[in-house]
Interface confidence: low
C-alpha cells in the first residue's frame, strides 16, 4: 500500500472531525455600525441571512457542504464580553488594557450598552475591540470566561487610529470540515466550501448595496489541503 492509502485508512479509523476551515471576510465592513453587525452576527436581532446563520445552515447540511462544526462568531462573543461586568478592565493612569483577573489599580470599563440589542455604541465598540482580543479567559469560572485572545487573537485584523479607536479589517470564522477520507471527499469539501463562501459574498454585498455605501467585500474559504485539490475542480474542462 502507498503511504497515501495508509493515511486515508488511519483517518477513517481514528478521526471524528476533519480539518479546520476558515471563512475569510475581506476588509471593508464597518463593524461598529449596527446594521452591518446584523449582517454578521448570529444572536437575537441579527438578520436571518447573516453570515453566522448561513454558516449554521451550511453545517446543518453536511452531505453537501462538508462542514461538521458551525464556526464561532467573534462578534457575538465580543457582545457577550462587553456585557459582562467582570471582563473589560483598564489602567486609570493611561487608559490602557488591563487583564480581567487584575484587581486595583485596574477599573471596570463600564461599557455603555445601547438599545434593545444591548450592544456597545460605535465609539465604545472601536475603543474596546483590542481589549477583547487581548483578554485571556479566566478558567476559574468566577471570572471572565469570554476573553477573546485564545479564540480570536489571530482571527481579527484591526488598525488603530486616534490612539484609542480600532477599525476592524479582515476577519475569519473558523469551523471544521467533516471527516475527509478519500480524494473525492477532499475536493468535494473544497467545492462545498467555495459554494458556501460564494453565497455569503452574494448575500453580504446585496445587503451592503441596500445601505448605499458602495462597499463590496469578498468571502473565501481556506483550509490547509485546498492547494492540493484545486486542480481537481477544473481537471475536465482543462483537458478539453
Amino acid at each position: 500500500d502507498s503511504f497515501q492509502t495508509k493515511y486515508f485508512q488511519y483517518l477513517n479509523r481514528y478521526l471524528n472531525i476533519g480539518p479546520p476551515v476558515y471563512f475569510v471576510v475581506t476588509e471593508g465592513l464597518n463593524y461598529s455600525d449596527m446594521d452591518t453587525q446584523n449582517m454578521i452576527c448570529g444572536t437575537r436581532f441579527c438578520r436571518p441571512d447573516s453570515l453566522s446563520m448561513q454558516l449554521y445552515a451550511a453545517y446543518r447540511n453536511p452531505n453537501e457542504t462538508y462542514i461538521a462544526q458551525p464556526p464561532n462568531s467573534w462578534l457575538d462573543d465580543y457582545f457577550d464580553w462587553s456585557a459582562l461586568p467582570n471582563c473589560c478592565k483598564y489602567f486609570p493612569s493611561n487608559s490602557s488594557f488591563c487583564p480581567n483577573d487584575r484587581g486595583a489599580p485596574c477599573k471596570a470599563c463600564g461599557i455603555a450598552l445601547e438599545g434593545d440589542e444591548q450592544r456597545p455604541n460605535s465609539t465604545e465598540f472601536e475603543r474596546y475591540v483590542p481589549f477583547f482580543l487581548q483578554d485571556i479567559p479566566d478558567t476559574s469560572g468566577s471570572g471572565c470566561v469570554k476573553g477573546g485572545h485564545a479564540a480570536y487573537g489571530q482571527a481579527v485584523n484591526y488598525k488603530m487610529f486616534n490612539k484609542t479607536q480600532a477599525h476592524v479589517g479582515a476577519t475569519y470564522y473558523q469551523g471544521y470540515h467533516t471527516v475527509l477520507k478519500t480524494s473525492l471527499d477532499y475536493y468535494s469539501a473544497l467545492k462545498g466550501a467555495r459554494e458556501v463562501a460564494a453565497n455569503l459574498t452574494e448575500t453580504l454585498n446585496r445587503n451592503l448595496k441596500h445601505q448605499l455605501n458602495g462597499t463590496t467585500i469578498n468571502v473565501f474559504p481556506y483550509s490547509v489541503f485546498y492547494v492540493f485539490y484545486e486542480q481537481y475542480l477544473t481537471m475536465w474542462p482543462d483537458t478539453l
Partner: nanobody, 125 residues
Framework: QVQLQESGGGVVQPGGSLRLSCAAS????????MGWFRQAPGKEREFVAT????????YYADSVKGRFTISRDNAKNTVYLQMNGLKPEDTAVYYC??????????????????WGQGTQVTVSS
C-alpha cells in the same frame, strides 16, 4: 459523530434536587466542549451551563448560578448537571449538547453541533 443520551429527569418538589446525566458515544469525548440547555413550553431553548474539554472551566446562566453545578467524567464519556434548590421556573426539557473546542465559553445554541433528545424536569408541589 457524537451521540448524546440524557437521563435523570423527573418530578421533584420545590427546593429539591436532581442530577442529570448525559452519556456520549464516540472515541474523542474529551475533545468536545459540553453544554446543558433547557426549553420550557412555548419558550426558546436557553443556555444553562457549559464545561470545557478538561473540565477546568465552567460557566453558568445567571438564573442557575449557585444552584446548579456542571461536571464531566471523560473516562466515562459522561457530563452531569447537579441541580439543587430547584424552583418551579426550572421546569423544562433539559438538553445536553456538544461542540468542538473553538471560540470562547459557548452560550448559544447555534454553536453546538450535536444534541441529545432531552429529559423532562418538572418542579411542582
Amino acid at each position: 459523530q457524537v451521540q448524546l443520551q440524557e437521563s435523570g429527569g423527573g418530578v421533584v418538589q420545590p427546593g429539591g434536587s436532581l442530577r442529570l446525566s448525559c452519556a456520549a458515544s464516540g472515541r474523542t469525548f474529551s475533545s468536545y466542549v459540553m453544554g446543558w440547555f433547557r426549553q420550557a413550553p412555548g419558550k426558546e431553548r436557553e443556555f444553562v451551563a457549559t464545561i470545557s474539554t478538561g473540565g477546568g472551566t465552567t460557566y453558568y446562566a445567571d438564573s442557575v448560578k449557585g444552584r446548579f453545578t456542571i461536571s464531566r467524567d471523560n473516562a466515562k464519556n459522561t457530563v452531569y448537571l447537579q441541580m439543587n434548590g430547584l424552583k418551579p421556573e426550572d421546569t423544562a426539557v433539559y438538553y445536553c449538547a456538544a461542540k468542538m473546542a473553538t471560540g470562547t465559553a459557548s452560550i448559544r445554541t447555534y454553536e453546538y453541533a450535536y444534541w441529545g433528545q432531552g429529559t423532562q424536569v418538572t418542579v411542582s408541589s
